[in-house]
Amino acid sequence: EDELQVIQPEKSVSVAAGESATLRCAMTSLIPVGPIMWFRGAGAGRELIYNQKEGHFPRVTTVSELTKRNNLDFSISISNITPADAGTYYCVKFRKGSPDDVEFKSGAGTELSVRAKPS
């Protein structure tokens, strides 16, 4: 049986300041059970970018509808990009745990670079 893979197809994405950036991520399986989250950076200091369950992420929208059944597309769009948003973004699958979920597998990352706003 093939184990779940986290696919981030783009190694890098370049976006002009003020535009929206789409960061693509797909899973190859619905199981193991557990949430998907997006982070900027890796390791202990990484920044949570999107978690559907908790938090307020006004600039982030999901590409697929939140009510889509058996969804495998976990791409997100970040609006009004600024140079401060530059960095490497990781789509991470967690395995359901009790009480805490456990990181299961991460995508390879997508590096977001921000171009100056065209004058």
């Epitope: 049986e1 184990e3 779940l4 399986s29 619905l30 199981i31 193991p32 059970v33 557990g34 949430p35 998907i36 559907q52 369950k53 999901t62 697929s64 509808e65 939140l66 009510t67 889509k68 059944r69 058996n70 969804n71 976990f74 395995r95 359901k96 009790s98």
Partner: antibody, heavy 120, light 108 residues
Amino acid sequence: DVQLVESGGGVVQPGGSLRLSCAASGFSFSNFAMTWVRQAPGEGLEWVSTIGSGDTYYADSVKGRFTISRDNSKNTLYLQMNSLRAEDTAVYYCAKDSTVSWSGDFFDYWGLGTLVTVSS
Amino acid sequence: EIVLTQSPATLSVSPGERATFSCRASQNVKNDLAWYQQRPGQAPRLLIYAARIRETGIPERFSGSGSGTEFTLTITSLQSEDFAVYYCQQYYDWPPFTFGGGTKVEIK
């Protein structure tokens, strides 16, 4: 058509064991989490256990006594029930999990159930 | 553990009338709530998921609403086959998945 057929229920003495099976067809079994839900006579629904791939989850009331497993080559879900108690008497339903996008699981198909009676 | 409380426990309704019953969660479950119908001697059947989305094949007379901690299932113009027990289930925070105690819809 999705079909779930439970078997293995019966009458067993307290402290005894039973193994329930659920034969699945009509969908890609290995791609979905599967769940056991039980219903005591005249009572409501109680979640028992869920299995993903290698990941398993149990209600506190059965933890350490029940073991959920699956054989994807046979499209079959199992529930090994040990140290059975009178309060385990119920109809046991096998259910297919479905998920909404980034959220948790609910149960879109159910078998007809198999009755387990624990009595001396 | 999130506790779901359904009310009323029993609802007596005449055929053709409207039935409305509620499911209250002990904490916020956002929209992660499903509704099931169980006819006597049968297995439960999924009616609604994500609080308001009808499962394929479920008649339009069934509708779900609410979010957070308060949810409602409404059946407009009850048919004879709608007399059954209805359960809500949350899938926001688990294990355990939890079900409400059920609402029995009986013929008045």
